[in-house]
């Protein structure tokens, strides 16, 4: 057993059939001493007397508030929680696996530059009764810190005949160097809870690695006379780190029709115009990666060939 | 300790497009080694990452952009001295700390051209001939330090009498190529930087 | 199983023009950018133009611009390439190829030779 | 218009051992080459499209690399149907231009 939080309990059980559970003694926070009782949850039912009590954990009707009273006056709680340990595995029942880009991926983040910030976020089918808390730092033998916010409720979603809830945190490297070259990684380790079930998540990754710059802005096109072709010029996004000389982006630039399977104009450049055929009813779009290490392309940015 | 804005002529660096390839060699023969050592710890998630011109050499600081200086974070930097002379610096306007920059450049790349030299005698004497360094990734980094034409003591290249350890050299080598993809990384985003200053 | 299939081996007079058809088979004619480009014997490939049969519109390279004419008839998925005022530096083999790329080509005709000869 | 060169025209190489063949822009071209097999009487075959994406059902010891002005085809381990002419091609701008041709032959 191992405090969360202040009264806040998480007792770590071997899941399985007939399993003998832990032996838990929970001591009420009073300087009384005599006629102190105790209670799980709502029910009045007392289950001990005394400083102290002593129970069996084995499943989740023994976890709860505990509460120990004296003449009507609580005294002190003790919320216990499980953490399911089964086939020597910590269950991952709260979030769902975003096999993206492997299996067992349940955190996901990104950055948009190189200056320290990062967002992650994870999904669920839960609805209620559900917290999560979120750490971070740089290593962990000798961690440098790293704020996270709170994690919020950022997008809802039906997938067949679930709702789909998606969860997302901010966090900021507190002395970041855009420059630098990382060594240690970034650890970020989720803590969740639902209802009286416990679970952690944790991700490990370098800045670099989940790079994704905002798509390019400002696209504009310019016809080419006598020629079917179109200049197509953009800027580097605002949220990409500066100078973008040192910062360097590299572009892909496509002309295709609405359907995925029609044909299409492709070009790659370091520069942030290209020349393009343009077709009726169809878009121009431009994404970005960082030019010099490979990490995710932007989503795109398009406008209409017409 | 940053780069300065006055540097040669645009597309007049004759470093840039050394740096190109390098990045491009390195990235290659990690993804070989990735490849060919496909049941070793050779990803970046399973490798330490250790740098080997830790406390020798200082290129992030060195060459520092001048619109990054004003950032906090990075200029906790170790004071290192360089010799200055170099056929990268094209122009008279180039100051110290450029030198300073090119200088630190060029000791990693002489740093990881003895460890790489190094490491390919040992894996040449592997009974399994298993994976070699690719020379073309040894002769971009000789390319780019001619580049740089910095006068400096020849490091004596390490020669090991006992038996070497194979599944340790090949484990070092992800390490040194993990690292080494790193630096060049940053070698280009400088080379590009002073390239369109 | 995409085809591109050309038309037989011509002889030609300096002066005159020449007309090299390509029938596609598999795949929707329309759904591709078709190109045709030539190899001189010995000689490296050179890029002549492209058509999109859907639109009809095309683009030649400079060296052709004004003797060569692509046009496509999507009833019989065929392509055609017109070369006129032949010389003798025009013997090659021309080539037809396509794909839903616009720059390269990933299924090519078999060639059709033609020589320019007095 | 963008000239491609290829280095070297010919190249002798031993069955089972590797190859690689060079080719240079006359400018910047990125990622847009191309590499294409051609044997004698048959059309090319694209082999790498955009400097080193992979074509499917070209054999995996055929691999691109480059970006810029400097580009590589590497055959990991020639085989007897390897034996053919090489092509590389630029799709940065119009007009669409080719290298020379590398002949790879038996050593």
């Known amino acids: 057993i191992w405090e969360l939080k202040k009264d806040v309990y998480v007792v770590e059980l071997d899941w399985y059939p007939d399993a003998p559970g832990e032996m838990v003694v929970l001591t009420c926070d009073t300087p009384e001493e005599d006629g102190i009782t105790w209670t799980l949850d709502q029910s009045s039912e007392v289950l001990g007397s005394g400083k102290t009590l002593t129970i069996q954990v084995k499943e989740f009707g023994d976890a709860g508030q505990y509460t120990c009273h004296k003449g009507g006056e609580v005294l002190s709680h003790s919320l216990l929680l499980l953490h399911k340990k089964e086939d020597g595995i910590w269950s991952t029942d709260i979030l769902k696996d975003q096999k993206e880009p492997k299996n067992k991926t349940f955190l996901r983040c990104e950055a948009k530059n190189y200056s320290g910030r990062f967002t992650c976020w994870w999904l669920t089918t839960i609805s209620t009764d559900l917290t999560f808390s979120v750490k971070s730092s740089r290593g962990s033998s000798d961690p440098q810190g790293v704020t996270c916010g709170a994690a919020t409720l950022s997008a809802e979603r039906v997938r067949g005949d679930n709702k789909e809830y998606e969860y997302s945190v901010e966090c900021q490297e507190d002395s970041a160097c855009p420059a630098a070259e990382e060594s240690l990684p970034i650890e970020v380790m989720v803590d969740a809870v639902h209802k009286l079930k416990y679970e952690n998540y944790t991700s490990s990754f370098f800045i670099r690695d989940i790079i994704k710059p905002d798509p390019p802005k400002n696209l504009q096109l310019k016809p080419l006379k006598n020629s079917r072709q179109v200049e197509v010029s953009w800027e580097y996004p605002d949220t990409w780190s500066t100078p973008h000389s040192y910062f360097s982006l590299t572009f892909c630039v496509q002309v295709q029709g609405k359907s995925k399977r029609e044909k299409k104009d492709r070009v790659f450049t370091d520069k942030t115009s290209a020349t393009v055929i343009c077709r009726k009813n169809a878009s121009i779009s431009v994404r970005a990666q960082d030019r010099y290490y490979s990490s995710s392309w932007s989503e795109w940015a398009s406008v209409p060939c017409s | 300790r940053n780069l300065p804005v006055a540097t040669p002529d645009p597309g007049m660096f004759p470093c840039l497009h050394h740096s190109q390839n390098l990045l491009r060699a390195v990235s290659n023969m990690l993804q070989k080694a990735r490849q060919t050592l496909e049941f070793y710890p050779c990803t970046s998630e399973e490798i330490d990452h250790e740098d080997i011109t830790k406390d020798k050499t200082s290129t992030v600081e060195a060459c520092l952009p001048l619109e990054l200086t004003k950032n906090e974070s990075c200029l906790n930097s170790r004071e290192t001295s360089f010799i200055t002379n170099g056929s990268c610096l094209a122009s008279r306007k180039t100051s110290f700390m450029m030198a300073l920059c090119l200088s630190s450049i060029y000791e990693d790349l002489k740093m990881y051209q003895v460890e790489f030299k190094t490491m390919n005698a040992k894996l040449l004497m592997d009974p399994k001939r298993q994976i070699f360094l690719d020379q073309n990734m040894l002769a971009v980094i000789d390319e780019l330090m001619q580049a740089l034409n910095f006068n400096s003591e020849t490091v004596p290249q390490k020669s090991s009498l006992e038996e070497p350890d194979f599944y340790k050299t090949k484990i070092k080598l992800c390490i040194l190529l993990h690292a080494f993809r790193i630096r060049a990384v940053t070698i280009d985003r400088v080379m590009s930087y002073l390239n369109a200053s | 199983q995409v085809q591109l299939v050309q038309s037989g081996a011509e002889v030609k007079k300096p002066g005159s023009s020449v007309k090299v058809s390509c029938k596609a088979s598999?795949?929707?004619?329309?759904?591709?950018?078709l190109h045709w480009s030539r190899q001189a014997p010995g000689q490296g490939q050179e890029w002549m133009g492209w058509i999109d049969p859907e639109n009809g519109d095309t683009e030649y390279a400079p060296k052709f611009q004004g003797r060569v004419t692509i046009t496509a008839d999507e009833s019989t998925s065929t392509a055609y390439m017109e070369l006129s005022s032949l010389r003798s530096e025009d013997t090659a083999v021309y080539y037809c190829?396509?794909?839903?790329?616009?720059?390269?080509?990933?299924?090519w005709g078999q060639g059709t030779l033609v020589t320019v000869s007095s | 218009d963008i000239v491609m060169t290829q280095s070297p025209l010919s190249l002798p190489v031993t069955p089972g051992e590797p190859a690689s063949i060079s080719c240079r822009a006359s400018?910047?071209?990125?990622?847009?080459l191309h590499w294409y097999q051609q044997k004698p009487g048959q059309q090319p075959r694209l082999l790498i499209a955009?400097?080193?994406q992979s074509i499917s059902g070209v054999p995996s010891r055929f691999s691109g690399s480059g970006s810029g002005t400097d580009f590589t085809l590497t055959i990991s381990s020639l085989q007897p149907e390897d034996f053919a002419t090489y092509y590389c091609?630029?799709?940065?701008?119009?007009?669409?231009?080719f290298g020379q041709g590398t002949k790879v032959e038996i050593k």
């Open positions: 091609q630029q799709s940065n701008s119009f007009p669409l231009t």
């Open positions: 400018q910047s071209i990125s990622i847009n």
């Open positions: 598999g795949g929707t004619f329309s759904d591709y950018y």
């Open positions: 955009f400097a080193s």
């Open positions: 190829a396509r794909n839903k790329e616009l720059r390269y080509f990933d299924v």
